[in-house]
């Protein structure tokens, strides 16, 4: 009789463990669902605002082909300019072609005139090679015209229709670039 009671007690305990496990799985599943729901809501919100706005670029950004550009209204050193762009989901301008350079310089002429604007180009201190922020090399026609004599880090900037170089710690305006939103229509 005692053995029978002991067996029943063990079975009950096993059942309880299984129920606890099931409850734990359910809680985990519920948490996972809530998390997915959050992502879905965020995605829907973004999609709705994009659909409502339907503009490929945010307000105050300029569009050209697949890119959106933002011309800053504040001065900063190159590294801070880079951070300012990242805060808006963009990077400092990376000029891929003469056509893009012409568009940028043409737009700047209309907006502000002949100022200095940091772009995402910097010179490697060891090799002296110019590289864009993503690690790619500029095309031969898009290398800074003058080599800065600075002992400090050297970065690229646009002025009028030229690409020039300067100590990265000098203060300039800057240009950010991000991908334009593709229309789903």
């Amino acid at each position: 009789k005692l053995l029978q009671v002991s067996t029943i007690a063990m079975q009950q305990q096993e059942k309880l463990i299984q129920q606890e496990r099931a409850l734990l799985n359910f809680t985990e599943w519920k948490r996972s669902c809530a998390l997915q729901m959050k992502y879905c809501q965020a995605f829907m919100q973004n999609s709705l605002s994009s659909a409502h706005n339907s503009s490929p670029c945010p307000n105050n950004w300029i569009q050209n082909r697949e890119s959106c550009y933002y011309v800053s209204e504040i001065w900063s050193i190159w590294h801070t300019s880079q951070e300012n762009c990242l805060k808006e989901g963009s990077t400092l301008l990376q000029i891929e072609s003469k056509e893009e350079m012409d568009f940028i310089t043409g737009s700047l002429r209309k907006i502000k005139g002949s100022y200095d604007y940091w772009v995402g180009l910097s010179q490697d201190g060891h090799s002296g090679r110019w590289l864009w922020q993503d690690g790619s090399s500029p095309s031969p026609g898009l290398l800074p015209a003058e080599r800065s004599q600075s002992a400090n880090q050297v970065c690229g900037y646009v002025k009028s229709n030229s690409l020039l170089s300067s100590n990265c710690s000098t203060w300039k305006y800057f240009i950010c670039e991000k991908y334009a939103l593709r229309s789903s229509v």
């Epitope: 965020a42 919100q45 805060k87």
Partner: nanobody, 115 residues
């Protein structure tokens, strides 16, 4: 406010590799870009690599060609694959989340490269 949790730091021989990971939680929908900073003793904090939600990349000159940043937007995670490590890469590496309102940083993870 975004909370960031780094993992993957440690001690490695020069020429070796390490992979750092960072998971974001909290106000993740406000994140426009994620990245990694590092700070060596007595030196200024520097941005090592960053990736925007649109996939645009940014690397410090000193790591170009050696480090690769990647991001999983759905999971709100960012990883930094570090190859051909040098003693001068020794630093505390901190994950960063860039939002219009500012930058949030993680606690950091120590990376030590021995020669």
């Amino acid at each position: 406010q975004v909370q960031l949790q780094e993992s993957g730091g440690g001690l490695v021989q020069a020429g070796g590799s390490l992979r750092l990971s960072c998971a974001a939680s909290g106000s993740i929908t406000s994140i426009n870009a994620m990245g990694w900073y590092r700070q060596a003793p007595g030196k200024q904090r520097e941005l090592v690599a960053a990736i925007t939600s649109g996939g645009r990349l940014s690397y410090a000159d000193s790591v170009k060609g050696r480090f690769t940043i990647s991001r999983d937007n759905a999971e709100s995670t960012v990883a930094l694959q570090m190859n051909s490590l040098k003693p001068e890469d020794t630093a505390v590496y901190s994950c960063a989340a860039f939002q219009s309102s500012g930058i949030d940083w993680g606690q950091g993870t120590q990376v030590t490269v021995s020669s």
